[in-house]
């Protein structure tokens, strides 16, 4: 049919370029290159119906369904989704093609389904059908990588049993301490499963797929390093493989390394050695202790000894199930607006946790730092002095942990007033929670010093606003005060704030605001 327009249907995926998680804001949004959805004519359908290729979208992803129409003249359009019509505003691109878009922000189950686009051009009418579904990630898994020795070779294989198939990479660093962070120039990455260079200072293997990234560090005892003040501890679950690397450097080759478990030499087949000369002609030896599948009786002190270095040990603990150990009692803090403060949680966990800090339904990235004593710590400082409840949530394959914090910000009260026919009410934030006084202003008391005590009802912390407690005080109207100005004052240790109200007829009449320091 010559009258049929040339139609192109595309899908644009958006990456939310935002450091915080759980934001409804689409700003700033970065777009991926458009993906062609085909848009073929649907055979045996009444009317002209184009069908786009099915679209699978991740939960919370943001997308645009877009149609480009190469047809003369103006076009009008209408989107229909689940029997509701949605506004449609076509525009024209530089090639003078009609462009119609449907933006779906933060994909949810309710936004999945058939999107019908009805287009009317000067020449003809036609329909375009998009089917949008949520990608089934229930079957997806991302497992922490583990190590295996390569058959007949002195090399390690990194394995992660994950769906979809993960990309595996080795992350190597020859520096000490913090400079082995991912973005450091000292870090080298190798996107391969097998690693032959096993002499480095810090060796990790990472696996990543659509669900994220998981890493496992090769546990190492370095006999040339001063031992930690507390014994290093390695946790494993029953059935997991154990790998410990002992490393030593000496001026010549005249030294040997051995592994012992609880003073008994490891059996043949549970260790292997490698050695090399370094650039300055010193000898580096490494001795691996490994158990392909640990049992409870593999628990104990593993000691690496050298004929030329002091020996060092690590405690290996085999557990049936993962754990997160930390105190979950809630903690309350109060600070001034001008002082800095960080929440912190100290915990011991295996396997490594995933964690978030949450405030007011907004989640923030969570950083963890390992301490020398086997504990880890997570700090959150970016509260921007907003009072309320902060939640630390951590989980791993076997355990969950939640800890609540309350942050109170010391500040002078600020009063809001409202009045009705029968009463006047004042509300105040501020911390510590304020106390209230009501005063009547009259000829006798032009400075509003006459205190009102009858008919006053105070409610402390009756509702939470953005995590802030609000205190209120209500004055029931009596004949004695009708027509007068009254003043409600909230005061705490940081100051006083007042609001003056005229009590005559219904309606809100905050009249004058006095702020008394």
């Amino acid at each position: 049919n010559q009258d049929l327009p040339v139609i192109k249907c595309v899908l644009i995926n958006h990456k939310n370029n935002d450091s915080s998680v759980g934001k409804s804001s689409s700003y700033p949004m970065v777009s991926e290159s458009p993906e062609d959805l085909g848009c073929a004519l649907r055979p045996q359908s009444s009317g002209t119906v184009y069908e786009a290729a099915a679209v699978e979208v991740d939960v919370s992803a943001s997308i645009t369904l877009q149609v480009l129409v190469d047809a003369p003249g103006n076009i009008s359009c209408l989107w229909v989704f689940k029997h509701s019509s949605l506004n449609c505003q076509p525009h024209f691109d530089l090639q003078n093609r009609g462009v119609v878009s449907m933006v779906i922000l933060k994909m949810t189950e309710t936004q999945a389904g058939e999107y019908l686009l009805f287009i009317q051009s000067e020449a003809t009418n036609y329909t375009i059908l998009f089917t949008v579904s949520i990608r089934n990630t229930l079957l997806y898994t991302l497992r922490r990588p583990y190590f295996r020795k390569m058959e007949n070779q002195d090399a390690l294989v990194c394995i992660s049993e994950s769906v979809p198939e993960p990309i595996v990479e080795w992350v190597l660093c020859d520096s000490q301490g913090e400079s082995c962070k991912e973005e450091s120039p000292a870090v080298v990455k190798k996107e391969e499963k097998v690693l032959h260079e096993l002499f480095g200072t810090d060796i990790r293997c990472c696996a990543r797929n659509e669900l994220g990234r998981e890493c496992t560090r090769l546990f190492t005892i370095d006999l040339n390093q001063t031992p930690q003040t507390t014994l290093p501890q390695l946790f494993l679950k029953v059935g997991e493989p154990l790998w410990i690397r002992c490393k030593a450097v000496h001026v010549n080759h005249g030294f040997g390394l051995t592994w012992e478990l609880e003073n008994k030499a490891l059996e043949e087949g549970n260790y292997f050695e490698m050695s090399t000369y370094s650039t300055n002609r010193t000898m580096i030896r490494i001795l691996f202790a490994f158990v392909s599948s640990v049992a409870r009786n593999d628990t104990g002190y593993y000691t690496c000894s050298s004929s030329k270095h002091p020996s060092q040990s690590a405690l290996v603990t085999i557990v049936e199930k993962g754990f997160i150990n930390a105190t979950n009692s809630s903690e309350d803090y109060e600070i001034d607006q001008y002082e800095e403060f960080c929440f912190s949680v100290r915990f011991k966990a295996y396997p490594q946790i995933r964690c978030t800090w949450t405030f007011s339904r907004k989640s923030f990235p969570c950083e963890q730092k390992g301490l020398d004593n086997g504990y880890s710590i997570s700090k959150f400082c970016n509260h921007k002095h907003q009072p309320g409840e902060y939640i630390f949530h951590a989980e791993n394959d076997d355990a969950q942990f939640t800890k609540m914090f309350t942050l109170n910000i010391r500040r002078k009260p600020q009063v809001l007033a409202e009045a009705s026919a029968s009463q006047a009410s004042c509300f105040s934030d501020g911390y510590p929670l304020p106390s209230w006084t009501w005063k009547k202003c009259s000829d006798k008391s032009p400075n509003c010093t006459e205190e009102i005590t009858e008919g006053v009802w105070n409610r402390k912390a009756n509702r939470k606003v953005f995590g802030q407690w609000v205190s209120s005080s209500t004055l029931n109207m009596s004949e004695a005060i009708k027509g007068f100005l009254v003043k409600c004052c909230a005061y705490n240790s940081l100051g006083t704030s007042c609001e003056t109200i005229l009590l005559n007829s219904p309606g809100p009449f905050p009249f004058i605001q006095d702020n008394i320091s």
């Epitope: 370029n17 935002d18 450091s19 915080s20 934001k23 804001s25 700003y27 700033p28 803090y333 600070i335 001034d336 607006q337 001008y338 002082e339 800095e340 403060f341 960080c342 912190s344 923030f364 950083e367 700090k379 959150f380 400082c381 970016n382 921007k384 002095h385």
Partner: antibody, heavy 116, light 111 residues
């Protein structure tokens, strides 16, 4: 990648005012405090003040009160520092910095030269 | 305001040796168990770079030869072994309370 991009150098007359900008990329400024710091030639660093762009609450070092005014525009992900009644004492490099968990990210600085 | 006194004002150290810079606060910079003392490095024509935060935590991509220590009011930055690239100005800074204050700076050079 987190970046703070500051506006270019300014040459201004005494008594005038100047407005410097600091545009965030790779993060949303609403989620962080944005601070401004002054550094006079060959001298140390002085904290001017900060803004919470989410609610426009500002805090200043008293010695910059009246001299500096910090604002933010969340739609363009940009913070601003306005300096008024400029004198030669205001000749300096002005930095913006983002505070989340400490002062990790800084802008490249804007040199303001006050000269007749 | 919390006043930070940094010493020495300038320091020359041989390559491979240890450089130690001290910073004393006029009052404690501790709050609920965290000391809000940070260290910055600044090279000519560049903006300051966070080296150490909260006394002893290394900033992103900072080499392990930079370490911090101290508590309460007395803090120090150690650089060992000293390298060519470490020639710069170093500032301590407290973020315990507003106004945030900086030390006067230490100019570190190669001997």
């Amino acid at each position: 990648e987190v970046q703070l991009q500051q506006s270019g150098a300014e040459l201004v007359r005494p008594g005038a005012l100047v407005k410097l900008s600091c545009k965030g990329s790779g993060f949303n400024i609403k989620d962080y405090y944005i601070h401004w710091v002054k550094q006079r030639p060959e001298q140390g660093l002085e904290w001017i003040g900060r803004i919470d762009p989410e609610n426009d609450i500002t805090m200043y070092d008293p010695k910059f009160q009246g001299k500096a005014s910090i604002t933010a525009d969340t739609s363009s992900n940009t913070a601003y520092l306005q300096l008024s009644s400029l004198t030669s004492e205001d000749t300096a490099v002005y930095y913006c910095a983002r505070n989340g968990n400490f002062f990790a990210y800084w802008g490249q600085g804007t040199l303001v030269t006050v000269s007749a | 305001d919390i006043v930070l006194t940094q010493s020495p004002a300038s320091l020359a150290v041989s390559l491979g040796q240890r450089a130690t810079i001290s910073c004393r606060a006029s009052e404690s910079v501790d709050n609920y168990g965290i000391s809000f003392m940070n260290w910055f490095q600044q090279k000519p024509g560049q903006s300051p770079k966070l080296l150490i935060y909260a006394v002893s935590n290394q900033g992103s991509g900072v080499p392990a030869r930079f370490s911090g220590s101290g508590s309460g009011t007395d803090f120090s930055l150690n650089i060992h072994p000293m390298e060519e690239d470490d020639t710069a100005m170093y500032f301590c800074q407290q973020s315990k309370e507003v106004p945030w204050t900086f030390g006067g700076g230490t100019k570190l050079e190669i001997k």
